[in-house]
């Protein structure tokens, strides 16, 4: 028999990834970051 459709078996949390660049002044350059679910991780 064919299998019925189900997910992978692992819970998936859908989150928004936001890349941003922020200018912090001419003598410090820029910060480039990655925000996942509201938390800056890089």
């Amino acid at each position: 028999d064919a299998e019925f459709r189900h997910d992978s078996g692992y819970e998936v949390h859908h989150q928004k990834l936001v890349f941003f660049a922020e200018d912090v002044g001419s003598n410090k350059g820029a910060i480039i970051g990655l925000m996942v679910g509201g938390v800056v991780i890089a």
């Epitope: 028999d1 064919a2 299998e3 019925f4 997910d7």
Partner: antibody, heavy 123, light 109 residues
């Protein structure tokens, strides 16, 4: 809250096509992971799964009836349809539709059912 | 899906046990077992009690418990109440065709 309601012709003759409609509210088939299926129950007997349709139009049928069954949906109107061709007296039953989600938050089981619609096939 | 017994006479307060056996394993390739239990009361549509073998659906009393693996599964009701009477169906959602057991009628002695 989630509700489903089936509607059909009530009575039809052998060899005709049975058209059923499941109208629902409280969820949307445009939501990833959502699906609706059909189940039937002859009076005083057990339950038989017929077909299921997912939000992305993926469809599954009971192989023993597949040549007779067509499931479809109208996402904007919150409706799912089942057609059974060439009906016979053995297709006399109460027909239920039920929601079944695919992802964890939707339980991945038939968590809400309609009240059922009675169909009689008689000459 | 083979369900036993087909009829189960009980007294209120008794423990009740219903067995369901599949002819082949219903473990899905994702590792989950899609074995469910539904209760149908007279004149009503079926209602979900247990899914994925042992997880109670929201609002289901903890006197209901599901267990088993592979091909053999059990539904237990620890203390039967009047509102528990009806027909219990096991159901497998792992393989096509999805199939129900024949049902077990829980009734008063």
């Amino acid at each position: 809250q989630v509700t489903l309601k089936e509607s059909g012709p009530g009575i039809l003759k052998p060899s005709q096509t049975l058209s059923l409609t499941c109208s629902f509210s409280g969820f949307s088939l445009s939501t990833a992971g959502m699906g609706v299926g059909w189940i039937r129950q002859p009076s005083g007997k057990g339950l038989e799964w017929l077909a299921h349709i997912w939000w992305d139009d993926d469809k599954y049928y009971n192989p023993s009836l597949k040549s007779q069954l067509t499931i479809s949906k109208d996402t904007s109107r919150n409706q799912v349809f089942l057609k059974i061709t060439s009906v016979d007296t053995a297709d006399t039953a109460t027909y239920y539709c039920a929601r079944r989600g695919l992802y964890y938050g939707n339980y991945d089981a038939m968590d809400y059912w309609g009240q059922g619609t009675s169909v009689t096939v008689s000459s | 899906m083979t369900q036993t017994p087909l009829s189960l006479p009980v007294s209120l307060g008794d423990q009740a046990s219903i067995s369901c056996r599949s002819s082949q394993s219903i473990v899905h390739s994702n590792g989950n077992t899609y074995l469910e239990w539904y209760l149908q009361k007279p004149g009503q549509s079926p209602k979900l009690l247990i899914y994925k073998v042992s997880t109670r659906f929201s609002g289901v009393p903890d006197r209901f418990s599901g267990s088993g693996s592979g091909t053999d599964f059990t539904l237990k009701i620890s203390r039967v109440e009047a509102e528990d009477l009806g027909v219990y169906y096991c159901f497998q959602g792992s393989r096509v065709p999805l199939t129900f057991g024949a049902g077990t009628k829980l009734e008063l002695k």
